[in-house]
Structures are given as C-alpha cells and as structure tokens.
Amino acid sequence: MMTGTIETTGNISAKKGGSVILQCHLSSTMAQVTQVNWEQHDHSLLAIRNAELGWHIYPAFKDRVAPGPGLGLTLQSLTMNDTGEYFCTYHTYPDGTYRGRIFLEVLESSVAEHSARFQIP
C-alpha cells in the first residue's frame, strides 16, 4: 500500500534570467527511494538522481541545470520558454512510484517576486 505523500513547491514564479529551485519531498513512508527523475512539461528528462550512481544531468540541460539542493533541482538562466509544468518522479521500494507536479511561471518583469510555498498537490 502506498502511504506516502509528495510535497512540492507548488506554483512558483521567477524572473527571466534568474534561477529557481524545484523541490519535492516524499514523506509519510518508510519506502526506500531508489531513483528520482525530473521531467519538463514536454516530458523530456532534465535529470536523474540514482541512489547508487548519483546525479545525471541530460546533455541538453547541462549548462542550465544544477543538481540539488537535496533531491531538488536548480534551473538557471531562465527563459520564457521555461514556463510550464515540471514533474518529480520518486521510484521507491516497495511502494512503487510517486509523482509530484510544479508549475513554473517565468516573468519578464524585473519586479517579479520569487514565490514558493510547500503544498500537497
């Protein structure tokens, strides 16, 4: 039985050219996390954090994606095209797969505030 829940940074906004942290947290389960996948809105993989191998950033994103903090992901040099959904997929044993969603809005405005709140989707 899957007892865990994924908490995410929810809906966030950040300035064009700036950076943002995408964060998911799995709680309420003793399941072992074997791998975390980070996907973009078009379902292309940004990065994988395998418990044994460590981080792998996909080549197309190596210049703009940094691993961490923790199992999260930092997106840098944001462009308007980065606006959209991001998904974290936690592969666990024995529970199975948990999935969290974050929506990122990249704003042109120089006064855009970086808003982030933890929420359970």
Epitope: T34, Q35, N50, E52, L53, H56, H91, T92, Y93
Partner: antibody, heavy 124, light 108 residues
C-alpha cells in the same frame, strides 16, 4: 555496505555442471537487477547473464544460451548461475554484479558493485 | 553484436601526466557507454557512465567524452593508484552488453 559474495566455483570436467551462488547483503535485494560477468585468465570482461529484480525476465549471452540459467531467490538474497555442458572456453573468474536500476526505474546494465569473483576451471 | 575496440592496448605514462584512452563502437551506442578500472586480483570499478557522467565518489581527474561510435576517457594527472587496466562497455537497451579489450596504463 553492499557486499556480494560468490561461491560454487571449482574444477569440473568438460560436459559437466556447476551451480554458482552469490549471497547479497547491505542492500534491499528484491528490486534490483543482477548480472553475471566473467573474465578468462589474462583476458577481458564478458557479460554472461542478467535477471530482473522480480526474476521474471532473464537475458543470456549467445555464448552460453541454452547451457547457462540465471535465477534468484529474493527470500534468501541470493543470485544463482546454473552452468551445464561446460566447455574449456568457460574457464574464467565469474563475478556477480548489482545493477543500479530496478523493475520500476528500468535497468542500466552497468555495475558499480561487484563480488570478488569465483574461479571456474573446465579441464579434463 | 556490437564490437568495442580500445586503443592503444598499452599506454606508458609518467605520474602527473595526462592519459587519453580511446574506445570505438562498431555501430552507434548513443551515449550508452561506461568506463571501468581494474587492478590485478580485483573486481572492476565503475568510473564513468552515460559517456561523461562520473559515478559517485570518482575523482574529478577522470573525465569521459564522446557519443555515437567514438569515445574517450581522459585522466588529467595520473596518480600512482591510477595505473591499471581500463575497459569500456556499451549498454544499448538490448543485450548483449559488450566490453572493449582493455587498455593497460603502465608507468613510463
């Protein structure tokens, strides 16, 4: 700490059989893919067989297909390689190795953790 | 079966120098390539996977590059513990998963 300990190697005549075992500890054995890789004396590495975490899927190199069978007992945290119709060219150190992937993540077929190996000698 | 060819068979290098090892696949393996180090009497040690990603705990002096059919492992400044045999391995999604014949890095 991940540990893989092979046993069951030894001297066997051509046409004979051996069963290798690999006792795993230090990790949750069940979900992870496992493989056997061998190395003939003074030679390079050769992948032999692989098995999924559940044991439902197996893969074998053409050189051993129909002669070798990989299996696992997740309740005993043990991997096996049943070797039949052995030939001189099967003489090698046999390593068991852990895949970083699971049934859920998919398998990598690369290996960070290896056992120390067990020597199989096929000779009359 | 995809054939992996490593060159040179032996590389003589002085400590502190750079070592460049090559691996060629008989057909494209995309970035599905790993590098291992093996010392006498020991099991192989995974260094690099996905052609260029270092495995956890591997020193930064080891780096990998290439894609398709041509790959390189570079050791930027050889330490005494780096003298060993190095193998490349392809792991395209379907078996068999094949290794190169190895490159022995020895002290010059």
């Amino acid at each position: 700490e991940v540990q893989l300990l092979e046993s069951g190697g030894g001297l066997v005549q051509p046409g004979g059989s051996l069963r290798l075992s690999c006792a795993a500890s230090g990790f949750t054995f069940g979900p992870y893919g496992m493989s056997w890789v061998r190395q003939a004396p003074g030679k390079g590495l050769e992948w032999v067989s692989a098995i999924s975490g559940s044991g439902a899927s197996t893969w074998h190199a053409d050189s051993v297909k129909g002669r070798f069978t990989i299996s696992r007992d997740n309740s005993k945290n043990t991997l096996y390689l049943q070797m039949n119709s052995l030939r001189a060219e099967d003489t090698a150190v046999y390593y068991c190795a852990k895949d970083p992937g699971t049934d859920s993540t998919g398998y990598y077929y690369i290996w960070r953790y290896w056992g120390q190996g067990t020597l199989v000698t096929v000779s009359s | 079966e995809i054939v992996m060819t490593q060159s040179p068979a032996t590389l003589s290098v002085s400590p502190g120098e750079r070592a460049t090892l090559s691996c060629r696949a008989s057909q494209s393996v995309s970035s599905n390539l790993a590098w291992y180090q093996q010392k006498p009497g020991q099991a192989p040690r995974l260094l690099i996977y996905s052609a260029s990603t270092r495995a956890t705990g591997i020193p930064a002096r080891f780096s990998g590059s290439g894609s398709g059919t041509e790959f390189t492992l570079t050791i930027s400044s050889l330490q005494s513990e780096d003298f060993a045999v190095y193998y490349c391995q392809q792991y395209v999604p379907h078996p068999p998963f094949t290794f190169g014949g190895g490159t022995k890095v020895e002290i010059k």
